[in-house]
């Protein structure tokens, strides 16, 4: 199917860099880099940086738990966040504080402002800052369902911890529901896990923004660190291009770096947006480790050579039993970026941008 | 990097078939096909077929939930099952029947017979046949921890159903624990989910092998359909080859079949073990849809052609922005097989055998 030539490493790198130029623009559905004429001077607004950092946190924790992604996730997602309604809102008076639960409510008009159509929502995460925890705590998350009933969503076993830590719950389905038919204010309940024969559990974990009900008072810590919904959605103008087939988020492995391997391996490539692409329009990050895959994947003719030594090579060189094995990315990671459209800063996440490992396929 | 030649479809198929010959032997760590001299005549034993079908059921439900797989999962796994200790065993007398729980105990000596070393265990599933259910039921699974305490493992929301259905819980970690330091008899508890403020829940679901405690009596249905542990493990003789790097199980997509697409796509290829490989030693299945990937993935030079039409091609032809995009499998599925070693039938599962979709990478 193909014949090998001597590899020109510089040409490979140039082709990879040029492919990335097109890839980024393609993911953002931009025909050309956006004009920088209206960009306000000075550093990025703090809120934008906070949002960018939230997205980076999400990326860091992501590769450990691969999950299916719709094809639509090829395209960049606009990232927004909606803070929990402050605890002096009357909605909180309707739900008596207890030793085993705390309540978090959200204004659906704010959600709809961020995501006008339910179908545009790609992912929604409930983010909670848990304070230092001295005992293991099993918690459950519920969704406000009808007036006074709660629907179980998920659970988490929280390990003891020496410092505060962000918790993230995937609530995509719930938020999609709220966007399509939610009331004015919708909410979640975080509760201690109670089994049918031990019901005296107390919610030991403190969530920033509350002191738990067992203390009787409900103190709000204002600002960025109270519970919020992190939303990733396709912008409305990009919506008509959605497709329904599926991509996957891969595993994070770095087994190849700093190796002298001649066969298929991941190779280091740092792309500086300004130097390599001549771009000033991406404000954060300044560049990223794109990397690329390179090296031969020999085909093994098993017919004439069926003995252990040759068969052992299959796992390395042709695990998928391909007719023409090829060195391709195995694990990819997303890249969040900050750029301006006119005077407006945008935080978007580009999927499958960083090659973490390669495989013969 | 490579130059294209006219594609000889027959050569591609032959190379794929021969690669599969080596792949199967390699996954089983066999230097050559096993001798069939001692294979007993007649059909496969019913227990072996039941086990094979359990494995096939597992495969069918699998691609919907991809999860990380250790590199060791490249190699075939031996599949066994251990039935729940019958309910007339005295262990059941120690745990009072209640309206909210049922108990299932297992003999660890049987587990150790199936899997001599904890490290060999690749996956363990608790399989329960739930009878038809007229109400939605939220259940929780617990593990027997010390004499009379129970550790929460997982939960499931069971939808109402008009017919019996197998439930499967991943209990790999628990069984691995039992293999290394378990008592003589270990067990699980299936309970109704109770929240801290609604504690009167009854276990409404009937599990084959019991009538739940609320009926007072405890009837055992003997045979294959009482709760069991489905175990997948590396056979002892194959253990020294385990590695720790990671592979992934992909998503199930079938978007390419019966398409006239000339570019990269999944192509149909059925392999009949007897006709195509001259093999009589695989007793089940008789063959399988291996399929393969074929078709060009053009590289796009974005530098000179930054306009929407060309950029739109990135998603299809070079989503990973590769310097030399290649048509490779995206979604792969495992294949369970039945074969004999001497007089002994074996059920083993071969990972990543069936190509469900392709991608340019």
């Amino acid at each position: 199917l193909s014949t090998c030539k001597t590899i020109d490493m510089e040409l490979v790198k140039r082709k990879r860099i040029e492919a990335i130029r097109g890839q980024i623009l393609s993911k953002l559905r931009l025909a050309s880099p956006p004009s920088q004429g209206e960009v306000p001077p000075g550093p990025l607004p703090e809120a934008v940086l906070a949002l960018y950092n939230s997205t980076r946190d999400r990326v860091a924790g992501e590769s450990a738990e691969p999950e299916p992604e719709p094809e639509a996730d090829y395209y960049a997602k606009e990232v927004t966040r909606v803070l929990m309604v402050e605890t002096h809102n009357e909605i909180y008076d309707k739900f008596k504080q207890s030793t085993h639960s705390i309540y978090m409510f959200f204004n659906t008009s704010e959600l709809r402002e961020a995501v006008p159509e339910p179908v545009l929502l790609s992912r929604a995460e409930l983010r909670l800052l848990r304070l230092k925890l001295k005992v293991e705590q099993h918690v459950e998350l519920y969704q406000k369902y009808s007036n006074n009933s709660w629907r179980y969503l998920s659970n988490r076993l929280l390990a003891p911890s020496d410092s505060p830590e962000w918790l993230s719950f995937d609530v995509t389905g719930v938020v999609r529901q709220w966007l399509s038919r939610g009331g004015e204010i919708e909410g979640f309940r975080l509760s201690a896990h109670c089994s049918c024969d031990s019901r005296d559990n107390t919610l030991q974990v403190d969530i920033n923004g509350f002191t738990t009900g067992r203390r009787g008072d409900l103190a709000t810590i204002h600002g960025m660190n109270r519970p919020f919904l992190l939303l990733m959605a396709t912008p409305l103008e990009r919506a008509q291009h959605l497709q329904s087939s599926r991509h996957r988020r891969a595993l994070d492995t770095n087994y190849c770096f700093s190796s002298t391997e001649k066969n298929c391996c991941v190779r280091q490539l740092y792309i500086d947006f300004r130097k390599d692409l001549g771009w000033k329009w991406i404000h954060e990050p300044k560049g990223y480790h794109a990397n690329f895959c390179l090296g031969p994947c020999p085909y093994i003719w098993s017919l004439d050579t069926q003995y252990s030594k040759v068969l052992a090579l299959y796992n390395q060189h042709n695990p998928g039993a391909s007719a023409a094995p090829c060195c391709v990315p195995q694990a990819l990671e997303p890249l969040p970026i900050v750029y301006y459209v006119g005077r407006k800063p945008k935080v978007e996440q580009l999927s499958n941008m960083i090659v973490r490992s390669c495989k013969c396929s | 990097l490579s130059t294209c030649k006219t594609i000889d479809m027959e050569l591609v198929k032959r190379k794929r078939i021969e690669a599969i010959r080596g792949q199967i032997l390699s996954k089983l760590r066999l230097a050559s096909p096993p001798s069939q001299g001692e294979v007993p005549p007649g059909p496969l034993p019913e227990a072996v077929l039941a086990l094979y079908n359990s494995t096939r059921d597992r495969v069918a439900g699998e691609s919907a939930e991809p999860e990380p797989e250790p590199e060791a999962d490249y190699y075939a796994k031996e599949v066994t099952r251990v039935l729940m200790v019958e309910t007339h065993n005295e262990i059941y007398d120690k745990f009072k029947q209640s309206t909210h729980s049922i108990y299932m105990f297992f003999n660890t000596s049987e587990l150790r017979e199936a899997v001599p070393e904890p490290v060999l265990l690749s996956r363990a599933e608790l399989r329960l046949l739930r009878l038809k259910l007229k109400v939605e039921q939220h259940v929780e699974l617990y593990q027997k921890y010390s004499n009379n305490s129970w550790r929460y493992l997982s939960n499931r929301l069971l939808a109402p159903s008009d017919s019996p259905e197998w439930l499967s819980f991943d209990v790999t970690g628990v069984v691995r624990q039992w293999l290394s330091r378990g008592g003589e008899i270990e067990g699980f508890r299936l309970s109704a989910h109770c929240s801290c403020d609604s504690r009167d829940n009854t276990l409404q679901v009937d599990i084959n092998g019991f009538t739940t405690g609320r009926r007072g009596d405890l009837a055992t249905i003997h045979g294959m359909n009482r709760p069991f542990l489905l175990l997948m493990a590396t056979p002892l003789e194959r253990a020294q080859h385990l590695q720790s790097s990671r592979h992934r199980r992909a998503l199930d997509t079938n978007y390419c079949f019966s398409s006239t697409e000339k570019n990269c796509c999944v192509r149909q290829l059925y392999i009949d073990f007897r006709k195509d490989l001259g093999w009589k030693w695989i007793h089940e299945p008789k063959g399988y849809h291996a399929n393969f990937c074929l078709g060009p993935c053009p590289y796009i030079w974005s530098l000179d052609t930054q306009y929407s039409k060309v950029l739109a091609l990135y998603n299809q032809h070079n989503p990973g922005a590769s310097a030399a995009p290649c048509c490779v499998p995206q979604a792969l599925e495992p294949l369970p097989i039945v074969y004999y070693v001497g007089r002994k039938p074996k059920v083993e599962q071969l990972s990543n055998m069936i190509v469900r979709s392709c991608k340019c990478s």
Epitope: L131, K134, V135, E136, P160, S163, N208, I221 | -
Partner: antibody
Amino acid sequence: VEESGGRLVTPGTPLTLTCTVSGFSLSNYAMTWVRQAPGKGLEWIGVIYAGGNTYYANWVNGRFTISKTSTTVDLKITSPTTEDTATYFCARDVGSSSSGVYFNIWGPGTLVTVSS
Amino acid sequence: AYDMTQTPASVEVAVGGTVTIKCQASQSIGSRLAWYQQKPGQPPKLLIYDASTLASGVSSRFKGSGSGTEFTLTISGVECADAATYYCQQDYSYRHVDNIFGGGTKVEIK
């Protein structure tokens, strides 16, 4: 809660202090070690949670190790220096009355003198 | 790091008077703060935890307030028995922390 094991040691001689508890279970409470040099303030060394997790002050750097049995909490000083001369206190957390770790039951302390 | 700074280092107060001790955290610690009293030759005694909750058996003359980075311990109707050194303690994080306790404030009675 009572500390023991404090004595005069020469620099570099390993020393283990023991905190013996009664009337409560260590599987339900976090325990801490705090020291106080003569005429100085309280200096936190580290904590062991009910579940066994241990956390140390930044400066500890492997010089101290906290461990426990069912009724004792040990503090091992791997290689004492003269700067480790102090009264060493062991204290128990308030337990489930707060999700924070605060210490409401303290031992009387045990004096460690490091001198050549 | 979450460093705790106490002011003043020492204070003199008349019997029946009121004394205010401040504790400042280098970063926000929410309300994860406790106050202790220590008398010479004795171990510390817990007075207040979670910034404002009075510990069991402690006189209501002791009052804790504040959240975030600024905290205050107020002793009203001071008695001779209140002569001691007072320490604050943060419980927000142990990571990269040199000391969870403040430097102490010595209260002397005139």
